[in-house]
Interface confidence: low
């Protein structure tokens, strides 16, 4: 039975009918509705929003919509004992205190339950000591401090600027350096675009604005107390001392007005080079400690936040497939926000809502997708991707057998310049073909395709005439599906011009100023970029759920595998003598990649020729495509990161947001020249090459003729 027998709409109009039903005005209306009050994970307000979404998805026409709840570890400031940082004099008197809250934006002065800026999961503590400025607190920044400048951070409070890498990596690096506290701040160099006003007059960060965020190093574990398993009613929970990924030193974020007060007194060493200087009118001295007249003054942190096991709620909607109901295409994005969530996440949640409404409209007219579509409104993403991870842990056996694809739907915009896509190579051709069919919303590209404007503004560094598509890293809800379960995944949003705007993320990220008005006034007044993102995300889901043959091209994986093998080989070849001494060879990896390329080519030829009317053969070929991503999963996981199991891609060990290729080999090679036991270190490189070569070869064989 073909999918068309389950519908009143002819096949060539299916996608068009779906896309035409998507309306910018609806997305705008939904965004407004979702952003009037805070929806912090674990709060009553966010539970009420979950029930509202459940009710509306049912009205839209989904077959079922359920709430899936979990009891996970969350973190909140103490309402009666606020967090702050002081400068204290030699008598211990506080002569300067950082602000306790962000000045509320116009129109929101009387809103209750705005959580003050804090670093989620910071332990309590009141450390005091000398300050050391550590730039972005990246691995290379600490190398510069410790190895080149001989500055010891042990027992010091470090101050780091936000940006470049995930804040949890900054905290981990500071801990490893022996720091006893971390102050995170937003420097105007990274969060204030020149020539743009600060909110409410523009989209820049005001001096009192502060970025909230979690500082965990979960490495894909989900709830810190129940790694690997769902945090359900009968869960066994670890003690807090054995919890996964919690920081061990107090951490607190501040804005640049407060940072100015701390940094202006800094003494000690001068910054090593201009890359360590931000845009404040301070010397950016590294320290340790304050200069001259202020040398007896210290910095003291006052952190009283608590970790609490709290109930969270995912909303899971189902649109049953007519032909292959046991094959799941998932569209998911989170619902919880730090405050109002004007961009993160509600610009994404509003798009998901409109996509559900459009699919529901088609279903009410008699249509069904070929495969089942699952829609998810995840909770507690901001606290470590907890909602999505717990749900995936609970449903892992179903997902690993039935999961076709996962499309992520967090923030729809982080700018309004061009499209940004990160996805598995299996989806490259799907994204290319889809964007060629969509109209560009960009000024100057009227009547042109989205593919054309995207390619022009964000060209591929390798292939001329094609757009850039990036590797998946982490820091969002696709993580468990891709990195742990090996389900083909992708994400799309509108972004800024990275060439001219070198700030990190968007300036008002995770601040109280991320409001509906920020989007409506400054980013997307016509909601045309939101509509385009809805078309891309929704179109991908539509094709994945409805095409007779899955729209995956395994040949694109072959191309990137060769590129990644070349890259990791060139990194290793920076140590030619050691490679010779320890007999390090990449022959097995290149051989496996060659085999993969040949087998993928032959598979693609068979895919063109097979009898698509034979449901058994069709299912067999589709299963080979579906399970290809799964074949890159190593059940043992990466070293010390058991929940990162994808051998080709993992979040960088130095920046959770970034994807790294052949991460096992990369990490084994990283800083290898400093290892105390070179023989052991190069042995691990050889082992990782072996694992990678085996995995690529094994994946190739899943594409071979079955008998």
């Amino acid at each position: 039975k073909s999918s068309n027998e389950a519908t009143n709409i002819t096949p060539k109009h299916n996608m068009k009918a779906f896309l035409d039903e998507l309306k910018a005005e609806n997305i705008k209306k939904f965004l407004y509705n979702f952003t009037q009050i805070p929806h912090l994970a674990g709060t009553e307000q966010n539970f009420q929003l979950a029930k509202q979404i459940q009710s509306q998805w049912k009205e839209f026409g989904l077959d079922s919509v359920e709430l899936a709840h979990y009891d996970v570890l969350l973190s909140y400031p103490n309402k009666t004992h606020p967090n702050y940082i002081s400068i204290i004099n030699e008598d211990g008197n506080e002569i300067f205190n950082t602000s306790l809250f962000e000045p509320p934006p116009p129109g929101y002065e009387n809103v209750s339950d705005i959580v003050p800026p804090f670093s989620a999961f910071s332990p309590q503590g009141m450390p005091e000591g000398d300050l050391v400025y550590v730039n972005y607190a990246r691995t290379e920044d600490f190398f510069k401090l410790e190895r080149d400048m001989k500055i010891n951070c042990s027992g010091k409070i470090v101050i780091a600027r936000y940006g470049k890498v995930f804040r949890g990596n900054k905290v981990k690096n500071a801990q490893l350096a022996g720091a006893k506290g971390v102050i995170l701040y937003s420097d105007p160099a990274d969060y204030f675009a020149p020539g743009v006003k600060s909110y409410p007059d523009g989209w820049n960060l005001p001096g009192g604005g502060v970025q909230r965020g979690n500082i965990l190093n979960l490495n894909g574990a989900g709830d810190p107390l129940t790694p690997g398993y769902p945090a359900n009613e009968y869960a066994y929970r670890r003690g807090i001392a054995e919890a996964v990924g919690l920081p061990s030193i107090p951490v607190h974020p501040i804005g640049y007005y407060d940072a100015q007060k701390l940094l202006e007194k800094m003494g000690g060493s001068a910054p090593p080079d201009s890359s360590w200087r931000g845009s404040l009118k301070v010397p950016y001295n590294v320290g340790p400690g304050f200069t001259g007249n202020f040398s007896t003054q210290k910095v003291k942190m006052h952190i009283h936040s608590t970790n609490e096991v709290t109930r969270i709620y995912n909303v899971i909607g189902t649109l049953r497939g007519a032909v292959e109901p046991d094959r799941y295409v998932i569209l998911g994005g989170h619902r919880d926000s730090w405050v109002f969530g004007g961009i993160d996440p509600q610009s994404g949640a509003a798009v998901v809502h409109e996509i559900v409404r459009s699919f529901g409209t088609l279903k009410k007219e008699g249509w069904r997708p070929r495969r089942t579509i699952l829609f998810a409104s995840w909770d507690a993403e901001e606290f470590g991707l907890l909602g999505s991870t717990e749900w995936a842990e609970e449903n892992s056996r179903l997902l690993q057998e039935r999961g076709v694809a996962y499309i992520n739907a967090d923030s729809s915009i982080e700018g309004n310049y061009t499209l940004r896509v990160d996805c598995t190579p299996l989806m490259y051709s799907l994204v290319h073909n889809l964007t060629k069919e969509l109209k560009s919303p960009d000024e100057g590209f009227e009547g042109k395709s989205l593919y054309e404007s995207w390619t022009k503004k964000s060209p591929s560094p390798e292939f001329s005439g094609m757009p850039r598509i990036s590797k998946l890293g982490s820091g969002n809800d696709f993580e468990v599906f891709f990195q742990r379960l090996g389900i083909a995944s992708g994400r799309a949003r509108y972004t800024k011009n990275w060439e001219t705007n070198k700030f990190s993320g968007y300036p008002l990220y995770h601040s109280v100023y991320e409001t509906y008005e920020l989007v409506e006034k400054f980013y997307d007044p016509m909601f045309k970029y939101h509509l385009t993102v809805a078309q891309v995300r929704g179109g991908m889901v539509f094709e994945l759920a409805n095409s007779i043959v899955l729209p995956f091209d395994c040949r694109d994986y072959a191309v990137v595998l060769r590129k990644y093998a070349d890259k990791i080989y060139s990194i290793s070849m920076k140590h030619p003598q050691e490679m010779k001494t320890y007999s390090v060879s990449f022959d097995s990896l290149f051989s496996a990649v060659k085999n993969f390329t040949e087998i993928a080519s032959k598979f693609s030829e068979r895919l063109q020729d097979f009898d698509k009317s034979n449901p058994i053969v069709l299912r067999m070929m589709n299963d080979q495509l579906m399970f290809l991503e799964r074949a890159f999963i190593d059940p043992l996981g990466l070293p010390d990161r058991p929940f990162y199991r994808h051998v080709i891609y993992a979040p960088s060990s130095h920046n959770k947001y970034a994807g790294e290729s052949f991460p096992g080999i990369y990490d084994a090679l990283f800083d290898i020249e400093s290892k105390v036991d070179p023989s052991k270190a190069w042995g691990e490189v050889k082992r990782q090459i072996y694992v990678a070569a085996f995995t690529v070869q094994a994946a190739a064989e899943t594409l071979s003729e079955v008998a």
């Epitope: 009666t80 004992h81 332990p123 309590q124 001392a241 608590t306 970790n307």
Partner: antibody
Framework: QVQLVQSGGGLVQPGGSLRLSCAAS????????MSWVRQAPGKGLEWVAN????????YYVDSVKGRFTISRDNAKNSLYLQMNSLRAEDTAVYYC?????????????????WGQGTMVTVSS | VIWMTQSPSSVSASVGDRVTITCRAS??????LAWYQQKPGKAPKLLIY???NLQSGVPSRFSGSGSGTDFTLTISSLQPEDFATYYC?????????FGGGTKVDIK
């Protein structure tokens, strides 16, 4: 100034009762677990009891269970220890102490603020 | 009950000496350990929490280390005001228990 000021000690006969008080100032009393710790003459420290911020959870050392009761009045910023059926071995300096939950919202991590201590002597 | 055993029970040292006091738990307590200093007739004072974290206002010559069952308090260079009795305390589970104390006196 953060401080705990104790009162209520004294001499009592075996089997008698005594109520110790501890007045807190300089911090948000209702945000902290509180404790009583004692020290017999010439001996080491012994934890006696803990009470949660809202008084909903209480814990005792086995040797005082059923005889001593820890309580608090957050409106008055005060902590109490009601001691009944006193024995000679209860003779000690009793300290009230603030519990500092430095890592997790648990019931006992470290005692960061201490009262001055009050002597309780149980003797006939 | 988790029993805490401190050693030595007393130590005689001179100003400037490095003094090390050990504390052993009868079962694993992760890093849930605090160290206190007590002078005669005075209330104890918190020095170290979470096994190795220096409480604010405590001189940096005091340091703590260890995890699991074995812990150490080190005074890197003994000062006249450091002559006192030192106690460890576990906060892993109820009942909370203290070590027997180590008296540091003048040699």
């Amino acid at each position: 100034q953060v401080q705990l000021v104790q009162s209520g000690g004294g001499l009592v006969q075996p089997g008698g009762s005594l109520r110790l008080s501890c007045a807190a100032s300089g911090f948000t009393f209702s945000s902290y677990w509180m404790s009583w710790v004692r020290q017999a003459p010439g001996k080491g420290l012994e934890w006696v009891a803990n009470i949660k911020q809202d008084g909903s959870e209480k814990y005792y050392v086995d040797s005082v269970k059923g005889r001593f009761t820890i309580s608090r009045d957050n409106a008055k910023n005060s902590l109490y220890l009601q001691m009944n059926s006193l024995r000679a071995e209860d003779t000690a300096v009793y300290y009230c102490a603030r519990v500092w939950d430095y890592y997790y919202d648990s019931s006992g991590d470290a005692f960061d603020i201490w009262g001055q201590g009050t002597m309780v002597t149980v003797s006939s | 009950v988790i029993w805490m055993t401190q050693s030595p029970s007393s130590v005689s040292a001179s100003v400037g000496d490095r003094v090390t006091i050990t504390c052993r738990a009868s079962q694993g307590i992760s890093s849930w350990l605090a160290w206190y200093q007590q002078k005669p007739g005075k209330a104890p004072k918190l020095l170290i929490y979470a096994a190795s974290n220096l409480q604010s206002g405590v001189p940096s010559r005091f340091s703590g280390s260890g995890s699991g069952t074995d812990f150490t308090l080190t005074i890197s260079s003994l000062q006249p005001e450091d002559f006192a009795t030192y106690y460890c305390q576990q906060a892993n589970s109820f009942p909370l228990t203290f070590g027997g104390g180590t008296k540091v006196d003048i040699k």
